[in-house]
């Protein structure tokens, strides 16, 4: 059966210099393969988070994404500035094999409004 | 630099018990998940139990479920493993190693010989 | 037994490339290393999710996938290679991490 990503909320709005928690769940994690944030689509879609390892500056997981049967993968990100304003993409991938992983289903999207302080 | 430096290991009868520590350095410890693999003399690797970052869950072979036990105080930096009912085919060197995002082993510790015999 | 398949051994002359090859497991649901131990010794990661090296390993060393088979390369081959090699893997459809039996590499002359 294909994997299903959901994210429930729509959008979300959060002050400037305040938290903001995107949520994010798959239904299975099989094929195996990373899961990534994005804001924007496209060419122009910027990563923004990636459950393989790297830091990214005031964003991290919300779960312990080092249980094996984890499907909880939402975010928290932390200072928000204006400039995070956007539609976030939480996307499942199929590891590539010797040629880049493969998109295979992404999320609705969340739509983040940043309010002024 | 990540150090894993594992202790514990001895002779111990057949039925018997021992607790195994690793004490990890040089690296958030709290925030990976960690394995013990074992190596029994002249043989391959063998996983043995895995333990998620914040220690909630583990997970088992079905060679040492029910008698292996994987627990860690993430105050201490520090690995366990409970080996109950011991038998002879548990006599090997126990490898305490760090895992990556998607449940391999990065960094190993340098082992500690546990020996079962009477 | 080990769920992973690998050969016994394999050899090889200075400066040429080593290919130790490793099946078993279900393309979809594993991830792959490989790892290096020499007698003695603990094991050294060489690679890990399928072809990605530790900064501190030579570039010689890399690893490929092709459908339910991996490969470990090992290109110009040197004496201090000469080492037990293991393919290790995560299976994500039991949460378990089998190994292949080991292939032991001999570094001829």
């Known amino acids: 059966t294909e994997v299903k990503v959901t994210q429930p909320e729509k959008s979300v709005s959060v002050a400037a210099g305040d938290s903001t928690i995107l949520n994010c769940t798959v239904t299975s994690l099989l094929p195996v393969g990373p899961i990534r944030w994005y804001r924007g689509v496209g060419q122009s879609r910027l990563l923004i988070y990636s459950f393989t390892g790297e830091h990214f500056p005031r964003i991290r997981n919300v779960s312990d994404t080092t249980k094996r049967n984890n499907m909880d993968f939402s975010i928290r990100i932390s200072n928000v500035t204006p400039e995070d304003a956007g539609t976030y993409y939480c996307v499942k991938f199929q590891r590539g094999s010797s040629e880049p992983d493969t998109e295979i289903q992404s999320g609705g999207g969340t739509e983040v409004y940043v309010l002024a302080k | 630099e990540v150090q894993l430096v594992e202790s514990g290991g001895g002779v111990v009868q057949p039925g018997g018990s021992l607790r195994l520590s690793c004490a990890a350095s040089?690296?958030?410890?709290?925030?990976?998940?960690m394995s013990w693999v074992r190596q029994a003399p002249g043989k391959g690797l063998e996983w043995v139990a895995g333990?998620?970052?914040?220690?909630?869950?583990?997970y088992y072979p079905a060679s040492v479920k029910g008698r292996f036990t994987i627990s860690r105080d993430n105050s201490k930096n520090t690995l366990y493993l409970q080996m109950n009912s011991l038998r002879a085919e548990d006599t090997a060197v126990y490898y305490c190693?760090?895992?990556?995002?998607?449940?391999?082993?990065?960094?190993w510790g340098q082992g500690t010989l546990v020996t079962v015999s009477s | 037994s080990y769920e992973l398949t690998q050969p016994p051994s394999v050899s090889v002359s200075p400066g040429q490339t080593a290919r130790i090859t490793c099946s078993g497991g279900?393309?979809?649901?594993?991830?792959y290393a490989w790892y290096q131990q020499k007698p003695g010794q603990a094991p050294v990661t060489l690679i890990y999710?399928?072809?990605k090296r530790p900064s501190n390993i030579p570039e010689r060393f890399s690893g490929s996938s092709s459908g339910t088979t991996v490969t470990l390369t090992i290109s110009g081959v040197q004496a201090e290679d000469e080492a037990d090699y293991y393919c290790?893997?995560?299976?994500?459809?039991?949460?378990?991490?089998?190994f292949g039996g080991g292939t032991q590499l001999t570094v001829l002359g």
């Open positions: 999710s399928d072809d």
């Open positions: 190693a760090r895992e990556t995002w998607n449940h391999l082993f990065d960094y």
């Open positions: 290790g893997g995560y299976d994500q459809s039991s949460y378990t991490n089998p």
């Open positions: 040089g690296f958030t410890f709290s925030s990976n998940a």
């Open positions: 279900s393309y979809s649901s594993y991830y």
């Open positions: 333990i998620s970052a914040g220690g909630s869950d583990t």
